[in-house]
Each structure stands twice: as structure tokens, then as C-alpha cells.
């Protein structure tokens, strides 16, 4: 990674010049699937790729308003086995539902101290955050 | 979104008190994965998640210097169906491999203009950028 | 100055439905970062966080309450609502909306700022 | 769902004594808030973001702690600092408030 300074005064800059992170992020799903009781371990014909996925899966909402990007989803397994292709709802021992992690790069809000330990605005921290981003139809792991 | 102030000015903070972004994120692969002539239409008994699923996928670099995270990894299908649980290799024409999209945040490196015109260090722009995380076994859509 | 303040049935009985209304001002529900909770405190004991409206209209509940509790706004007229269903009289308590949103020079604190006087509430057959 | 603890439950101390109230989570977590309640009051925000004291609060009140230790201290115990007090978190995932059971402390 190449560096960049990551420290914004809160003053030197006029305000009328600040970019706004204004923009709404599209979540990927519909808002119907963040509610648990509406799903269920099945794969469905319709709908959404997380409903139609025969490693099915909600999505849980992460919010904080101190971290870029302020709203995160993650995934949560319907099912411990994958649904079978054939009936959409019965489930297939020989496959299980795992899920998919990333270590995704997020700024954390932070305060900036001064040379004489005076607060200067704030800081972008830079993380990584894991966030599980989907279910997925896997073999089981032969051990060797 | 609430609203946050993007600019960093390149003067006016001390430079010892700049954070950097020196940590390498930890693609969600092995390097090998990436080559596609190494990867085939089978899902694997060992291996990483995109190898052993029955929708299995490769990555793709995407980097660019002027944008945070600068490296992003694109899924791709290594199949149009997915692969049967039970032999790893025959396609099962009753399953769907689709691509998982997501909109990421991302921030790009821009110049920033002061009142005058001139430059002032520079200002993080946020954007949404589409990447595909992962390929899902899904039923095909059926059309009603 | 912001106030909040919150009402309610006052008496109400087991496997009825419990409603409670928060009507505030000094302040708008609209604003970016903004939000609203409601707190619990059944009498010589301690608070307990019960649901949270942020100002987009995203919702959070305790879990292990979730299936009874429904939050919801009126931002026309500054209202913050909260449902629970099939009330017991495990839910007899004096009931606060909080305000959550103040925004420093370092981020959003994750505090109550203000805090309504409460209103209680008696679950009783 | 991360758990507060605080200790103790209930204390006693003398006019110009210190105080320490603690507050243990049961995973790390970024900040601690507190409150101060009074009987027949609603709570009041006493400490923001592990240190930083709400308007009003005296300069004696402190706030320390990171991880998973969290307190709350009194240098020099006053009448008017008799109250229960409460640790808050906030968690991001699932998003969810979290009080501790608090510390009743009552002036010898």
C-alpha cells in the first residue's frame, strides 16, 4: 500500500469547499430480508440472490457512525447444509452452507492531537474489518 | 449518511502527527487463484471457499494508486452451472452459477481548489464502486 | 432548549398491548445522525435498553425483546412511538425516551444526551 | 450480546474520601459513557467517550479505561455525589445499547 496522510484539521479549510459524504449506500438486499422471521431455509424461485441461493442467507445490519462506511452488512447462514437443487427445500447432506469472509478496509473517526496535545479536528484511522459477505454451497474438506 | 467533512489539507498539521495507511489488506485468496489456466470447472475437496464451492470463482486484481482500498478483488465464474455435490465436476443444469454484486465505498484521491483556485492538498472523494464478491448456486429465476 | 417527554396508559393488563408516546422538540428527528431510544427501569432497579429509531428510520431492537417491541416516528409531529405486545407483569417499569446525536469535533458520541422524566407503567390483572 | 458488569454493587464512602466505581465488559470495546441518577430523576449523561466529563459535571468526577476495564472515579467525595451510577456501551453488530447494573454510592 502506498501511504497517505489520513488527518483532517478541523480548520485551515473553508467549509464551503468540504466534500460531503452525503451519497446512500445501496444495501445488498431488499430491506425484507434484514428481518429474520421473513426467511427461512429454502431456496426460492424468485427474489433476491441471497433468497434464490441454495446456501441461502439474511443480511444483519452493523452501524456506526464513527466508521466509513457507516452502515455494513453481514451475512448469516439460513442453513447449515445446502438446499437441494431439485426440491429447492430439502437439504443435502454433501454439501454445507459456509460463509464467505473479507477483511474489508474501513476509516475510523478518531481525534487528532496537536504537537502540544491540543485537539486538531480528527483523524481517519484506517482498519480492517471483517464482514461476512455471503453464504456459499461448498464440498466438505476432505482431511488428508 | 450523516455528514462528515472529506478534505485533508496537505499543510497546517504537523507531519509526524499524520497517520499512515501502511496496513496491507489480506486478500480474501491465495495468490495462485488468480491464474485462470490453474483453476477449472470443478468444485475442489480442500483448498480455499472459491475453490471448494460448486459455484466456484477466481479473482481478478483491481488497483488503482489513487483510490482507498487500492487493490479490489473481482470474482469471476469459472462455471455457468454449478457442479454437482456428489462428483465435483459434472455441471447440474438445474442450478444457476450468478455472480454476487456489491456496491463498495470507496474513496478517490483528488485535487482539492481553494477560493482562489489554487491547490490545497488534496480531498477524498466518496464513491460507490460495484464489485462482484463471490459466485452463488441459485434456482434459476423462475418467470411468473 | 430540547425537552422530551413521554406518556402512556399508566395501568394496563397482562397480554395487553402497551403503547407509549414520545413528544419532543428543541430538535428534529430529520437531522444526519440523529436518533431516539427507549429505556426502561421497573422500580429499585437498573435501566434497560429496550429500542432505538435512528433518523433515516433504521430501527434496532434488544434481541431477546424483538418479537414484542415495534419503534416508529412522526417526524410532522415529533413523535416517537413504541409498541410491546402480550405485556406480562414483568413489564411493569418506569419508562424513558432518550435522544441520541451530539456530534463533536472527534465523531458522535453514543450517549443519551437528554432524557425524558418517564412514565410509569403498571402491568396488573 | 456483550455483557456490563459493574462493581460494586453498592458503596459507602466519607466526605473527601476517593472513590473508584468499575466497569467490566465481557469483550474489548472502544468507549465507556456513565450516568448519574438520582431517586424520583431521570438519568443524567455524566461521562462521554471513557473521559471526556458532560457539561456541568465537577472536575473531581474522572473517567479511564480501555478494553475491557472501564471506571469511574471521585477524588475527593461530596454529599452531592450520592447517586447510583450506570456504564453504557454501544455496540455496532447487532447495533444495541448495554447498561451496566450500577453502583449505588451513598455518603457515610
Known amino acids: 500500500y502506498s501511504h497517505w496522510p489520513s488527518c483532517c484539521p478541523s480548520k485551515g479549510y473553508p467549509s464551503e469547499e468540504l466534500l460531503r459524504w452525503s451519497t446512500v449506500p445501496v444495501p445488498p438486499l431488499k430491506p425484507a430480508s434484514l428481518d429474520f422471521h421473513s426467511v427461512s431455509c429454502r431456496a426460492s424461485e424468485d427474489g433476491p440472490l441471497n433468497s434464490r441461493a441454495i446456501s441461502p442467507w439474511r443480511y444483519e445490519l452493523d452501524r456506526d457512525l464513527n466508521r466509513l462506511p457507516q452502515d455494513l452488512y453481514h451475512a448469516r447462514c439460513l442453513c447449515p447444509h445446502c438446499v437441494s437443487l431439485q426440491t429447492g427445500s430439502h437439504m443435502d447432506p454433501r454439501g454445507n452452507s459456509e460463509l464467505l469472509y473479507h477483511n474489508q478496509t474501513v476509516f475510523y473517526r478518531r481525534p487528532c492531537h496537536g504537537k502540544k496535545g491540543n485537539h486538531k479536528g480528527y483523524c481517519l484511522e484506517r482498519r480492517l474489518y471483517r464482514v461476512s459477505l455471503a453464504c456459499v454451497c461448498v464440498r466438505p474438506r476432505v482431511m488428508g | 449518511y450523516s455528514h462528515w467533512p472529506s478534505c485533508c489539507p496537505s499543510k497546517g498539521y504537523p507531519s509526524e502527527e499524520l497517520l499512515r495507511w501502511s496496513t496491507v489488506p489480506v486478500p480474501p485468496l491465495k495468490p495462485a487463484s488468480l491464474d485462470f489456466h490453474s483453476v477449472s470447472c470443478r468444485a475442489s475437496e480442500d483448498g480455499p471457499l472459491n475453490s471448494r464451492a460448486i459455484s466456484p470463482w477466481r479473482y481478478e486484481l483491481d488497483r488503482d494508486l489513487n483510490r482507498l482500498p487500492q487493490d479490489l478483488y473481482h470474482a469471476r465464474c469459472l462455471c455457468p452451472h454449478c457442479v454437482s455435490l456428489q462428483t465435483g465436476s459434472h455441471m447440474d443444469p438445474r442450478g444457476n452459477s450468478e455472480l454476487l454484486y456489491h456496491n463498495q465505498t470507496v474513496f478517490y484521491r483528488r485535487p482539492c481548489h481553494g477560493k482562489k483556485g489554487n491547490h490545497k492538498g488534496y480531498c477524498l472523494e466518496r464513491r460507490l464502486y460495484r464489485v462482484s464478491l463471490a459466485c452463488v448456486c441459485v434456482r434459476p429465476r423462475v418467470m411468473g | 432548549q430540547v425537552t422530551l417527554k413521554e406518556s402512556g396508559p399508566g395501568i394496563l393488563q397482562p397480554s395487553q398491548t402497551l403503547s407509549l408516546t414520545c413528544s419532543f422538540s428543541?430538535?428534529?428527528?430529520?437531522?444526519?445522525?440523529?436518533?431516539l431510544g427507549w429505556i426502561r427501569q421497573p422500580s429499585g432497579k437498573g435501566l434497560e435498553w429496550l429500542a432505538h429509531i435512528w433518523w433515516d428510520d433504521v430501527k434496532h431492537y434488544k434481541p431477546a425483546l424483538k418479537s414484542r417491541l415495534t419503534i416508529s416516528k412522526d417526524i410532522s409531529s415529533s413523535q416517537v412511538f413504541l409498541t410491546i405486545a402480550s405485556v406480562d407483569t414483568a413489564d411493569t417499569a418506569t419508562y424513558y425516551c432518550a435522544r441520541m446525536g451530539q456530534l463533536h469535533y472527534y465523531g458522535y458520541d453514543y450517549a443519551m444526551d437528554y432524557w425524558g422524566q418517564g412514565t410509569s407503567v403498571t402491568v396488573s390483572s | 450480546q456483550i455483557v456490563l458488569t459493574q462493581s460494586p454493587a453498592i458503596m459507602s464512602a466519607s466526605p473527601g474520601e476517593k472513590v473508584t466505581i468499575s466497569c467490566s465488559a465481557s469483550s474489548s470495546v472502544s468507549y465507556m459513557y456513565w450516568y448519574q441518577q438520582k431517586p424520583g430523576s431521570s438519568p443524567k449523561p455524566w461521562i462521554y467517550?471513557?473521559?471526556n466529563l458532560a457539561s456541568g459535571v465537577p472536575a473531581r468526577f474522572s473517567g479511564s479505561g480501555s478494553g475491557t476495564s472501564y471506571s469511574l472515579t471521585i477524588s475527593s467525595m461530596e454529599a452531592e455525589d450520592a447517586a447510583t451510577y450506570y456504564c453504557q456501551l454501544y455496540h455496532s453488530y447487532p447495533p444495541t445499547w448495554t447498561f451496566g447494573g450500577g453502583t449505588k454510592l451513598e455518603i457515610k
Open positions: 467517550r471513557t473521559s
Open positions: 428543541g430538535f428534529s428527528l430529520s437531522t444526519s445522525g440523529m436518533g
